[in-house]
Interface confidence: medium
């Protein structure tokens, strides 16, 4: 084995061409110059390499590169990017887009693997803050990005960033998660006209609180039942039959389907029967006339 | 702004060691993907490529002159340096010291310096 | 090694006129990855050269846009449109496909 860690004679690499993939994993290691390879990164994933031989090449990179590889490296990365851990990943700083986007474009197609997770993480931390564009970014390539960070690194977030959000991007998202997001997309959409600001809000409503929900009751929304049912609990058991009706409009009638299920049923069970027959939907529950209705957080305030 | 400067003797006898460095000023040499060069021109003629430096030490030498060529790098000092030993006449020329950049093109050069092999 | 071959070797323009320098390489400049690795530096007189184009075709921060770039392959061509008085000095091609780097043997440009 001693012999085969000299290159052949003729066969050091002068540059990195297609030629390479005629070479075995020891004349890779042996013939191809680190400096080389990391001058000429740009090149490697036009060329058909083998696992095994982006295994060596990877080795040469760590080689030259102890403390993380540098960002001009990182971004021409391609396929040996599959290559690297979390741990690797971990020692790279990685500030820009163009570079953030060239890896995720890699692993496009597959779920967030650890090797993305953390190289966004790192992204993230570096820049501070979760802007427009890496938002706008990461949601393309993993519509669920923004629900799978905790509320805390949401609060991260800027509100000018909401403009990025789309409702597909706030499908898994918890209540939590809408909590911390909500009051970001309020601020956000502000100066919009009612019927186009609702367009907007109605993705983040998950973390509205009552007042919210009243205010958005005047302004003849028409909320559709999908966006109701998300609502939460707490802010929905508040509202009156009245603003129920007026908040969904010609979608009051879709609460008849949805009366066993959170939010409508714990709604109705706060309401007065003769309030609920108003409706006109057959909702059953309420409570009957002649009960006095107490507000027990209230009663527990004054205690 | 990244500047490049050259140091070192003007006059090399023959048979000797020729030692030239280049500080770096403006940036660090431990720049992200940066290689650092040095191209000599003989009087008159045209430029000829000698060999490059990465910070972490690895090198790459002009095959022409690579028994002769030894490229250091002190990223304390943000200098690289080079020597050319067993020197000849054939080796008077201005030497230049430059950045390759993303180790493809020289975007700056040092001013060069005149070494004469003469006894 | 590449060999890269400069014609003509001097020229002499009038201010205002267009000039045209050609260079050739042994070997295509032309990588699988689509780029092209060649650049075209001037040295000015009493000067080091200074990259103005990179790639065969991108002018360098600060190069004015009267020089332009084309070609693939083997053969490439710097114009400038209309040659200034400042524009005088040498100017040579350079690959970086293939190590050892190599330059042509440089054009000198002078004003009529």
């Known amino acids: 084995e001693v012999e085969k860690t000299a290159c052949p004679s003729g066969k050091k690499a002068r540059e990195i061409d297609e030629s390479l993939i005629f070479y075995k994993k020891w004349e890779l290691e042996a013939c191809v110059d680190a400096a080389l390879l990391a001058t000429q990164m740009d090149r490697v994933n036009a060329i058909p390499f083998t696992y095994e031989q982006l295994d060596v090449l990877k080795h040469k990179l760590d080689e030259l590169y102890p403390q993380g590889y540098p960002e001009s490296v990182i971004q021409h990365l391609g396929y040996l990017f599959l290559k690297m851990s979390p741990e690797d990943i971990r020692k790279w700083n990685v500030t820009s887009l163009e570079t953030l986007k060239a890896l995720l474009e890699v692993n496009k197609g597959h779920e967030m693997s650890p090797q993305v997770a953390t190289l966004i993480d790192r992204f993230v931390k570096g820049r501070g803050q979760l802007d427009k564009d890496t938002l706008d970014t990461l949601t393309a390539f993993y519509p669920g990005y923004l629900c799978s960070l905790s509320p805390e690194e949401l609060s991260s977030v800027p509100p000018s960033s909401i403009w990025a959000v789309r409702p597909q991007d706030l499908d898994t998202c918890d209540p939590r998660q809408l909590d911390v997001l909500y009051p970001k997309a309020r601020l956000a959409f502000q100066n919009m006209n009612g019927s186009e600001y609702f367009v907007k809000i109605q993705s983040f409503l998950g973390g509205a609180p009552t007042e919210d929900l009243k205010a958005l009751s005047q302004q003849n929304v028409s909320m559709d039942l999908a966006t109701f049912m998300k609502l939460r609990t707490d802010a929905v058991l508040p509202l009156t039959v009245a603003e129920v009706q007026k908040l969904l409009g010609p979608h009051v009638e879709g609460l008849k389907a949805e009366e066993r299920h959170r939010p409508v049923r714990d709604w109705i069970l706060r309401q007065r029967q003769d309030d609920l027959d108003t409706l006109g939907l057959g909702l059953q529950g309420g409570i009957p006339n002649g009960y006095l209705v107490l507000d027990l957080s209230m009663q527990e305030a004054l205690s | 702004q990244v500047q490049l400067q050259e140091s070192g003797p003007g006059l090399v006898k023959p048979s000797q060691t020729l030692s030239l460095t280049c500080t770096v000023s403006?940036?660090?040499?431990?720049?992200?993907?940066?290689?650092w060069s040095w191209i000599r021109q003989h009087p008159g003629k045209g430029l000829e490529w000698i060999g490059y430096i990465y910070y972490s030490g690895s090198t790459y030498y002009n095959p022409s002159l690579k028994s002769r060529v030894t490229i250091s790098v002190d990223t304390s000092k943000n200098q690289f340096s080079l020597k050319l030993s067993s020197v000849t006449a054939a080796d008077t020329a201005v030497y230049y010291c430059?950045?390759?950049?993303?180790?493809?093109?020289?975007?700056?050069w040092g001013q060069g310096t005149l070494v004469t092999v003469s006894s | 090694d590449i060999v890269m071959t400069q014609t003509p070797l001097s020229l002499s323009v009038a201010p205002g006129q267009p000039a045209s320098i050609s260079c050739q390489s042994s070997l295509s400049l032309q990588h699988s990855n689509g780029k092209t690795y060649l650049y075209w530096y001037l040295q000015k007189p009493g000067q080091p050269p200074q990259l103005l184009i990179y790639?065969?075709?991108n002018r360098f921060s600060g190069v004015p846009d009267r020089f332009s770039g084309s070609g693939s392959g083997t053969d490439f061509t710097l114009k400038i449109s209309r040659v200034e008085a400042e524009d005088v000095g040498i100017y040579y091609c350079m690959q970086s496909k293939q190590l050892p780097y190599s330059f042509g043997q440089g054009t000198k440009l002078e004003i009529k």
């Open positions: 790639e065969v075709s």
């Open positions: 430059a950045r390759l950049r993303g180790g493809y093109k020289f975007d700056y």
């Open positions: 403006g940036g660090s040499i431990s720049g992200d993907g940066h290689f």
